[in-house]
């Protein structure tokens, strides 16, 4: 009984349960391939518990191994559109600090209109994740079609 | 030492480790786009620890943020079949209670024969998840090709 | 306070946080469809905390339910290449011990050049996971395009 009480009194943050699920806000200005994200219960089913948004990019607050996942659906798209506009590529990476810049996850659309994937990766406090969509096609802002999230898994 | 003993004595359920992985049982009757799921060790590698099945649909028993994942493969399918029968779309959503009805995850097959994705989403006790497959193509019942699951991540 | 101290003193391994993320090392020798994996911080962002590699295949060290995920991208590939070389299929399964041999996850490339999926599955200490790529196309060894991992979720 003592354990259960103690467990309830510990703030979740001390257990390292950082988690975020974001929805697309907008694409970047010209020559900026980044997608800009937003999150919060007022917006729907998106949320940030631990990580933060910095100008639409996700910043990590706790060191650890994270599961990073993403789905992006192109807005006005058929298999012929997708192949005609090829290559359309999505890359998720650490974009700052510059010393830790690296691509974590990369996918091309080819003849499809949706990409979805996930991976485990070590991230450090202060790492900012960017999602670059290169090509001429636009992403859907529907919250069930395009989303991006992270989940802290272990130290 | 006291902590370790206490931890072992606590039932797993009190840690909130609700998890389920389901295999396809059958498709719905005419005009019902829902897939009907089944789970349990006697069936293979599917299981329910916490959530329950209600007439083939998954019902959540614990509030929290969940990782929802799905893969659906079409049974008799080639890229030409898939494009000829387009649009074939899969949507995962909360279908009851009606007041919380919402689409969580949506994917189209386009020229592919498999879709797979995952996302984090808040779910509440009593939420029932439905998976709607619209189109004329049938899903494979092979357990390594078509499956649907949830994992409780945090309160 | 006693709880927090005790929690910090427990080795992570006792909490069952086994996790691994691997990068592609090489394809198999003659008539061997298996992909051979490697992991470790010296190689980049891959790691093994708990599971081990046995001749390039992933061996599980702790019983439990795991989230298994994979992404494989073909190296020289366009939608026309992929369809011309069809069927190219990836299967993840338990390959030893032979008594537990089973396919867990199967995907075909059809007209795409990347497959990505994930699933929950029970695994036991000593289970070895193999990833079989059948067909004539070659996988990319880029660490952001091809990776394979497992995460212990619960007992």
């Amino acid at each position: 009984q003592r354990f259960a009480q103690a467990q309830q009194q510990l703030p979740l943050e001390s257990l390292g349960w950082d988690v975020a699920e974001l929805q697309l806000n907008h694409t970047g200005p010209q020559q900026d391939p980044r997608l800009y994200w937003q999150g919060g219960p007022a917006l729907g089913r998106s949320f940030l518990h631990g990580p933060e948004l910095d100008k639409g990019q996700l910043r990590i607050h706790r060191d650890g191994i994270y599961m990073v996942h993403i789905q992006v659906t192109l807005a006005i798209c058929s298999s012929t559109t997708a192949s005609r506009h090829h290559p359309t590529t999505l890359a998720v990476g650490i974009c700052s600090p510059a010393s830790r810049s690296i691509s974590l996850l990369r996918l091309s659309f080819h003849q499809g209109c949706t990409i979805a994937s996930q991976r485990l990766t070590p991230l450090a406090r202060g790492d900012t994740l960017c999602t670059n969509l290169t090509g001429t096609l636009l992403p859907s802002r529907n919250t069930d079609e395009t989303f991006f999230g992270v989940q802290w898994v272990r130290p | 030492q006291r902590f370790a003993q206490a931890q072992q004595q606590l039932p797993l359920e009190s840690l909130g480790w609700d998890v389920a992985e389901l295999q396809l049982n059958h498709t719905g009757p005419q005009q019902d786009p829902r897939l009907y799921w089944q789970g349990g060790p006697a069936l293979g590698r599917s299981f329910l620890h916490g959530p329950e099945l209600d007439k083939g649909q998954l019902r959540i028993h614990r509030d929290g943020i969940y990782m929802v994942h799905i893969q659906v493969t079409l049974a008799i399918c080639s890229s030409t079949t898939a494009s000829r029968h387009h649009p074939t779309t899969l949507a995962v959503g909360i279908c009851s209670p009606a007041s919380r009805s919402i689409s969580l995850l949506r994917l189209s097959f386009h020229q592919g024969c498999t879709i797979a994705s995952q996302r984090l989403t808040p779910l509440a006790r009593g939420d029932t998840l439905c998976t709607n497959l619209t189109g004329t193509l049938l899903p494979s019942r092979n357990t390594d090709e078509t499956f649907f699951g949830v994992q409780w991540v945090r309160p | 306070q006693r709880f927090a101290q005790a929690q910090q003193q427990l080795p992570l391994e006792s909490l069952g946080w086994d996790v691994a993320e691997l990068q592609l090392n090489h394809t198999g020798p003659q008539q061997d469809p298996r992909l051979y994996w490697q992991g470790g911080p010296a190689l980049g962002r891959s790691f093994l905390h708990g599971p081990e590699l046995d001749k390039g295949q992933l061996r599980i060290h702790r019983d439990g339910i795991y989230m298994v995920h994979i992404q494989v991208t073909l190296a020289i590939c366009s939608s026309t290449t992929a369809s011309r070389h069809h069927p190219t299929t990836l299967a993840v399964g338990i390959c030893s011990p032979a008594s537990r041999s089973i396919s867990l996850l199967r995907l075909s490339f059809h007209q795409g050049c990347t497959i990505a999926s994930q699933r929950l599955t029970p695994l036991a200490r000593g289970d070895t996971l193999c990833t079989n790529l059948t067909g004539t196309l070659l996988p990319s060894r880029n660490t952001d395009e091809t990776f394979f991992g497992v995460q212990w979720v619960r007992p």
Epitope: I102 | - | H26, T27, G28, Q31, R45, A75, I76, L138, T143
Partner: nanobody
């Protein structure tokens, strides 16, 4: 620039044998795989056999048991031993190489595909 030079084609009677060779030269970083494709008149180019740098081999169903692919890594050369040849094996045979160029830290691989000019194999009595 990488070049592939094929040799060994020619006219052979049904049931006979031929050995094709393909040598890669130029600024080769690493050959990931080499293989042979063929194209018969009015048909699409199809894979005959391929071999990876780890020794993995793949054969078209139509040539299994008759053709053998092998590779000499030191010479950057691939061979195709063709036995029990049939009239339907008549085609232009093309050598193919997939190059893997590694650069940077962390390593990033760039994949390139190179084709030979082709060598004609005619199986006829």
């Amino acid at each position: 620039q990488v070049q592939l030079v094929e040799s060994g084609g020619g006219l052979v009677q049904p049931g006979g044998s031929l050995r094709l060779s393909c040598a890669a030269s130029g600024s080769i970083f690493s050959i990931y795989a080499m293989g042979w494709y063929r194209q018969a008149p009015g048909k699409q180019r199809e894979l005959v056999a391929a071999i990876t740098n780890s020794g993995g081999t793949n054969y078209a169903d139509s040539v299994k048991g008759r053709f053998t692919i092998s590779r000499d890594n030191a010479k950057n050369t691939v061979y195709l031993q063709m036995n029990s040849l049939k009239p339907e094996d008549t085609a232009v045979y093309y050598c193919n190489a997939v190059l893997e160029q590694a650069s940077g830290d962390p390593v990033v691989y760039r994949y390139l595909e190179v084709w030979g000019q082709g060598t004609l194999v005619t199986v006829s009595s």
